[in-house]
C-alpha cells in the first residue's frame, strides 16, 4: 500500500510534536472588536509542535514529503503542524440591521495532523 | 466579517512564498521499488514558500493564526504552506494477484496554501 | 433545537457534595463560543450564576463559590457536570443548566431540578 | 461585584395596557463598542426562565415586539407595550459586562 503507518508516539519527547493547544485570545488581538459582541474573550484551539518523520502523517502525500525532507531537506520542506478538522463557533456579531449569532466552521481548530 | 482579504502578492520576493513546486523523485527515492512497478520517475508537486501575514490563507482559521504569531511569536506558530487538493495519479503495482493499476487521490498536490 | 436535562439526587446531606449532571442533545456540546452554564434559585428567591464551562475545558467560576465549586465536562456523553462541597442548608436551590454565549445571551436552559440540603 | 437593582417589586397590570419595569445597575453596563451589557429574562410559573432581550434592546428569537429594552448605562426599562394574560410571572435583568454576571432581584408581573 502506498500507506506507511503513521507514528503516533512523539520521539522528541511530551509535548514536543504536532498537537492541539489552547491559546486566548481578546477581540482586540484579533482585530476583532469592532464587529463582534461576545464572546470577548476566545479559547482558539490551535495546531503546534513539529513533525518528525511519519509522525501523523495526514495522508500518502505527507509520508512522501517526509521521506524526500530526509533526502533533500533543503529543497523539500518537512510536514507540518495543521487542522485535521475544525470545531463550530458562535460569535454574536454587529450586522447592518443590529446584532446576529453567526455559526463559524473553520475558526477553531479540533484536531491535528502533520500535512 | 471573519474573513480579511488573503493576499496573493508576495511581499517576500518572487517564488519565495507559499507555491507549487515540482519534485523529481526515483521509486528508490521514496522506498517503492519493491512494488510500484510504473511510473519509475515520479512528478512530484508539493507545496512550498514561507507564508507572510494573510499571504494564501486557507481559511478564518490561518488568518487568526497569523494575528496570533505575529502577537506570540514564540507561542503560536506561523501558517505553513500545505496542499489545498490533490491530484489523482494512477500506479501501476504488484498485487498478491498479479499486476494491478490504481489512482491514489492524496498523492500529488495539485495547489497550496497558508494553514 | 437544543435541550438540556437536569439530573441528580434532589438530597444532599451538610458537609457532603452535591453533585448534577446536565446533559445536551439535539446539539454538540463541542460547539465553540456556548459557555455550559450553572445558575441557581433559592426557593422564593432570584437567580445567582454559578460558573461555566467552555467546550475546551476552560471553566470560570462565581468568586463566591469558588473554593467549592467544580464544573466539568465529558463530551463524549455530551454531558457536563456541578460539584458543590461542603454543602450546608443555604445551598438549597432550584439548579438550571444553561446554555450561554460567554456570560449572556441563556437562550437555552434545563427544566430545573430542586436540590435540598438537609441531614 | 456588580449590583443589579430593580423596580417595582411588584407590578399589577390590566391586559391591554402598557407596562414598565425598571433596572439600574451599580456601574455602567455601557462597553467601549457601543452596547450595553444587559439582558432582560421572564420566568413564567413553574417554568425555566426565558431569554426576552440581550445587548439592552435586541429581541431575542421568537419574542414578541411588545416586548423592548432600552436605556443606556446604569438605567434601563423594559416595556411591555399592551400587556397579555400569558406575560405574567417574574422578570429578571441581569449585566453581562462581568463576571461573575449579576441579577437583579426580579420584579413580579400579575393581572390585576
Known amino acids: 500500500s502506498a500507506h506507511a503507518h503513521p507514528r503516533d508516539s512523539c520521539p522528541l519527547g511530551p509535548g514536543r510534536c504536532c498537537h492541539l493547544e489552547t491559546v486566548q485570545a481578546t477581540l482586540e488581538d484579533l482585530g476583532w472588536s469592532d464587529w463582534v459582541l461576545s464572546p470577548r474573550q476566545l479559547q482558539l484551539s490551535m495546531c503546534v509542535g513539529e513533525c518528525p518523520h511519519l509522525y501523523r502523517s495526514a495522508n500518502t502525500h505527507a509520508q512522501i514529503k517526509a521521506r524526500l525532507h530526509g533526502l533533500q531537506p533543503d529543497k523539500v520542506p518537512a510536514p507540518c503542524c495543521v487542522p485535521s478538522s475544525y470545531t463550530p463557533v458562535v460569535l454574536m456579531h454587529r450586522t447592518d440591521s443590529g446584532v446576529s449569532l453567526q455559526t463559524y466552521d473553520d475558526l477553531v481548530a479540533r484536531g491535528c495532523h502533520c500535512a | 466579517s471573519a474573513h480579511a482579504h488573503p493576499r496573493d502578492s508576495c511581499p517576500l520576493g518572487p517564488g519565495r512564498c507559499c507555491h507549487l513546486e515540482t519534485v523529481q523523485a526515483t521509486l528508490e527515492d521514496l522506498g517503492w521499488s519493491d512494488w510500484v512497478l510504473s511510473p519509475r520517475q515520479l512528478q512530484l508537486s508539493m507545496c512550498v514558500g514561507e507564508c507572510p501575514h494573510l499571504y494564501r490563507s486557507a481559511n478564518t482559521h490561518a488568518q487568526i493564526k497569523a494575528r496570533l504569531h505575529g502577537l506570540q511569536p514564540d507561542k503560536v506558530p506561523a501558517p505553513c504552506c500545505v496542499p489545498s487538493s490533490y491530484t489523482p495519479v494512477v500506479l501501476m503495482h504488484r498485487t498478491d494477484s498479479g499486476v494491478s493499476l490504481q489512482t491514489y487521490d492524496d498523492l500529488v498536490a495539485r495547489g497550496c496554501h497558508c494553514a | 433545537q437544543v435541550q438540556l436535562q437536569e439530573s441528580g439526587p434532589g438530597l444532599v446531606k451538610p458537609s457532603q457534595t452535591l453533585s448534577l449532571t446536565c446533559t445536551v442533545s439535539?446539539?454538540?456540546?463541542?460547539?465553540?463560543?456556548?459557555?455550559w452554564t450553572w445558575i441557581r434559585q433559592h426557593p422564593g428567591k432570584g437567580l445567582e450564576w454559578i460558573g461555566a464551562?467552555?467546550?475546551?475545558?476552560?471553566?470560570v467560576y462565581n468568586p463566591s463559590l469558588k473554593s467549592r465549586v467544580t464544573i466539568s465536562v465529558d463530551t463524549s456523553k455530551n454531558q457536563f457536570s456541578l460539584k458543590l462541597s461542603s454543602v450546608t442548608a443555604a445551598d438549597t436551590a432550584v439548579y438550571y443548566c444553561?446554555?450561554?454565549?460567554?456570560?449572556?445571551?441563556?437562550?437555552?436552559w434545563g427544566q430545573g431540578t430542586l436540590v435540598t440540603v438537609s441531614s | 461585584d456588580i449590583v443589579m437593582t430593580q423596580s417595582p417589586l411588584s407590578l399589577p397590570v390590566t391586559p391591554g395596557e402598557p407596562a414598565s419595569i425598571s433596572c439600574r445597575s451599580s456601574?455602567?453596563?455601557?462597553?467601549?463598542?457601543?452596547?450595553?451589557?444587559l439582558d432582560w429574562y421572564l420566568q413564567k410559573p413553574g417554568q425555566s426562565p426565558q431569554l426576552l432581550i440581550y445587548?439592552?434592546?435586541n429581541r431575542a428569537s421568537g419574542v414578541p415586539d411588545r416586548f423592548s429594552g432600552s436605556g443606556s448605562g446604569t438605567d434601563f426599562t423594559l416595556k411591555i407595550s399592551r400587556v397579555e394574560a400569558e406575560d405574567v410571572g417574574v422578570y429578571y435583568c441581569?449585566?453581562?459586562?462581568?463576571?461573575?454576571?449579576?441579577f437583579g432581584g426580579g420584579t413580579k408581573v400579575e393581572i390585576k
Open positions: 444553561a446554555r450561554g454565549v460567554e456570560y449572556q445571551h441563556f437562550n437555552e
Open positions: 439535539g446539539g454538540s456540546i463541542n460547539s465553540g463560543g456556548y459557555y
Open positions: 464551562i467552555y467546550y475546551s475545558g476552560s471553566t
Open positions: 456601574q455602567s453596563l455601557l462597553h467601549s463598542n457601543g452596547y450595553n451589557y
Open positions: 445587548l439592552g434592546s
Open positions: 441581569m449585566q453581562t459586562l462581568e463576571a461573575p454576571p449579576t
